[in-house]
Amino acid sequence: SELKTACKKHELYVSFQDLGWQDWIIAPKGYAANYCDGECSFPLNAHMNATNHAIVQTLVHLMNPEYVPKPCCAPTKLNAISVLYFDDNSNVILKKYRNMVVRACGCH
Amino acid sequence: SELKTACKKHELYVSFQDLGWQDWIIAPKGYAANYCDGECSFPLNAHMNATNHAIVQTLVHLMNPEYVPKPCCAPTKLNAISVLYFDDNSNVILKKYRNMVVRACGCH
């Protein structure tokens, strides 16, 4: 396979209908969730938002790839969204769900 | 390949000599850095410390595995360590380095 691109945020729109949640979620119909993907390879440059541990792990992986994996590309900033939905008693509830939208990614 | 085990913390001792840092780091000689590895597969149970986004991404991955990856196994809790080292002017410095030790892992 080709070399993967560096760890970064990718756009992803999630439709609640596609997830089969349309019967209990009233609004929105979906949202821009996004996701993180890409390589966390040496050298980890500034835009990869790498932790100190990720930098150490990258060096150990290069030395010892059979036992220690590369760090992985994961969200570093997440936002909430508000959802209007029916609860179990068919009441309409407005609730803020934390950590639903990826705003930024990094190597962890 | 076989099913990988679920996302969890793995023990890893890092020797500063192996990293080639022995000439500038005085103490410690190394430290228990640990690392995260394993699958973030459906269903994401409680001990996987999954974010709401990771739960959504897992469902989207099941629907569309070619385009959206599984969430990745990454540190959820990191600790600092204190390091005694020589700076560029050969002064001995004691500094606390953040995010050096993995304490817990989760699906992100």
Epitope: L3, L62, M63, N64, E66 | E2, T5, D18, E39
Partner: antibody, heavy 121, light 112 residues
Framework: QVQLVESGGGLVKPGGSLRLSCAAS????????VHWVRQAPGKGLEWVGR??????????EYAASVKGRFTISRDDSKNTLYLQMNSLKTEDTAVYYC????????????WGQGTLVTVSS | QSVLTQPPSVSGAPGQRVTISCTGS?????????VHWYQQLPGTAPKLLIY???ERPSGVPDRFSGSKSGTSASLAITGLQAEDEADYYC???????????FGGGTKLTVLG
Amino acid sequence: QVQLVESGGGLVKPGGSLRLSCAASGFTFSSYVVHWVRQAPGKGLEWVGRIRLETHGYAAEYAASVKGRFTISRDDSKNTLYLQMNSLKTEDTAVYYCARVERSKSGFDNWGQGTLVTVSS
Amino acid sequence: QSVLTQPPSVSGAPGQRVTISCTGSSSNIGAGYSVHWYQQLPGTAPKLLIYGQSERPSGVPDRFSGSKSGTSASLAITGLQAEDEADYYCQSWDSSQTLVVFGGGTKLTVLG
């Protein structure tokens, strides 16, 4: 001392199957990643595949040339590595070595003596 | 064709110094992965000679040394001896295709 001993090689017809074993002794087998490497007569070394540890779910990876035909497994209770070879081709003729990966720098620090697999009609 | 490129053969007289090169790419040696070297005497299994670029396992004479720069690595043998006549292979790890990659091997001939 560390020892790896392969067995199970022999003559097999194209399309046939063979199962190789690698018996390990003198070390804690379950703590080491192990690989199969082969060498066709008069040729260089070719990586076949590897199997990781229990903590990594015994994940196995393969070279493109054998993927889908060969399966690597291990039995830590028996200190044994296996290579199941199906749909064998004449180009699979080689000496097959098992090799242990040392734990700090990932080099193959111990090799078996090899077992010859000949695929011919 | 091997992912890592080595010269098919090198030769030298006893006592001389020879080097064997191993050229890779940005997805293996150039990506920072360790390089290991193996010696294979005729009719025997390979033996680890150098690991992690430049470290020698116990029992390997200090006449053997390894180095790495950019996308290449090299093995140097000083004070060449008749018993050094063997095939030498470099090996690394590759993030773009197969995991483990080998060089095609270099046959070292000790002259005279």
